[in-house]
Amino acid sequence: KFSKQSWGLENEALIVRCPRQGKPSYTVDWYYSQTNKSIPTQERNRVFASGQLLKFLPAAVADSGIYTCIVRSPTFNRTGYANVTIYKKQSDCNVPDYLMYSTVSGSEKNSKIYCPTIDLYNWTAPLEWFKNCQALQGSRYRAHKSFLVIDNVMTEDAGDYTCKFIHNENGANYSVTATRSFTVKDEQGFSLFPVIGAPAQNEIKEVEIGKNANLTCSACFGKGTQFLAAVLWQLNGTKITDFGEPRIQQEEGQNQSFSNGLACLDMVLRIADVKEEDLLLQYDCLALNLHGLRRHTVRLSRKNPIDHHS
């Protein structure tokens, strides 16, 4: 559970995260397990520890081995292990299985290929993408943030895709590559203008002052996996994150469900400790995809608590 395999290529950057859960404020000590030697934290070292992260800048084949991270909270010390393997660069174009990240599959309607592990690095767009060592060119290929989008996917698009990016550490640049297989599913799906199932348009939701309230925005977008579909909440026409009221939060991540084969998403708006001023706000459930945007508005009204007579 707390041992994680990581791999990289010599002369590239490799960053590994300790597989233990902790807070940013916790101290994390790293050791090379075979010698029990502490990993330095000074950035002038080629291999150094930086909190939850262990950085090889760049990696060498001799760095391969098991590294121990000890996460020290005020109450406990927890141990995790990173099993690191650094491979020599291949002279030919073949990417061996042991360098491959998990396979992803796509379809005509949805063809996102995420660049693995990129969130650990300090990189700037654009990413470079290769298929079978050839740089991808043409309008069908779009590098967007940390993923590649392929338009009008065909079965011939299946294969091994490599992303390449530059990690920057204190002004020094290091190359990183990561490869994963992409398979193409034949999917008879379709996309519709969003249909909001809940809430009803101009719904009035009764809430109790001082209590917590949840509003669910639920919409369906068609059949099969959908490309660029989202549901979200707005307050008085403003994104929740920009509104600046910590009591009112969107649930992290959107739940995806398939009801009757339809692809649906829902987003829960949680209001903690409902206040009088919350009743004055306009709550908009927004559903959008490539076809357009649909909006349903909800308002809150005060629910009078039932008197309990003892």
Epitope: S73, T75, F76, R78
Partner: antibody
């Protein structure tokens, strides 16, 4: 020495809500996680959930998702557990306990909540 | 959701005897299990943390073993002060306590 101070007892009516407090001394609650645990009379321990007081992130056991709300006020070094729509099933001792993500080490003495009309 | 089955529910032993309590989980949790002691009218006390690590100040007659799904907690040479309820806690997936074992003296 780390101490967690909880009120001794609460008597509440069915259907009402109650907010329990837990104040830490000799320890900054921001530095770790606060867990809440329920123990019904003559029964075992049930984990309610945990909160990271530094950022307010919470995680609840599925059973308590709609029953409990955990909050924290770092300025007063106090964690809170609010229980809503109380029934006799909620009659129990509620413990706060400090620990990391995985377990609890320091415990309060518990607040006894009695739901009765 | 990871569930924990603890046995026995209660046991009675003479002073000096060995006590064995078992917890079984429905999923492989490596060694992420903790053991608590609770005496009447008191909050629980952590005796052993994950990886079979004895907490500071806990007597060495307490120990635990196990990995994966099967875990055992042992008291060697039980003393009268060990009369209490004992709980295992898994924290691989959320946190779940075992149902508890009541230890009494004959």
């Amino acid at each position: 020495e780390v101490q967690l101070q909880q009120s001794v007892a609460e008597l509440v009516r069915p259907g009402a809500s109650v907010k329990l407090s837990c104040t830490a001394s000799a320890f900054n609650i921001k530095d770790d996680y606060m867990h809440w645990v329920k123990q019904r009379p003559e029964q075992g321990l049930e984990w309610i959930g945990r909160i990271d007081p530094a950022i307010g992130n919470t995680e609840y056991a599925p059973k308590f998702q709609d029953k409990a709300t955990m909050t924290a006020d770092t300025s007063s070094n106090t964690a809170y557990l609010q229980l809503s729509s109380l029934t006799s099933e909620d009659t129990a001792v509620y413990y706060c306990a400090l620990g990391d993500f995985y377990a609890m080490d320091y415990w309060g003495q518990g607040t006894s909540v009695t739901v009765s009309s | 959701e990871t569930t924990v089955t603890q046995s026995p529910a209660s046991l009675s032993v003479a002073t000096g005897e060995k006590v064995t309590i078992r917890c079984i989980t429905n999923t492989d949790i490596d060694d992420v299990i903790h053991w608590y002691q609770q005496k009447p009218g008191e909050p629980p006390k952590l005796l052993i943390s994950e990886g079979n690590t004895l907490r500071p100040g806990v007597p060495s007659r307490f120990s635990s073993s196990g990995y994966g799904t099967d875990f055992v907690f042992t008291i060697e040479n039980t003393l009268s002060e060990d009369v209490a309820d004992y709980y295992c806690l898994q924290s691989d997936n959320m946190l779940t306590f075992g149902a508890g074992t009541k230890l009494e003296l004959k």
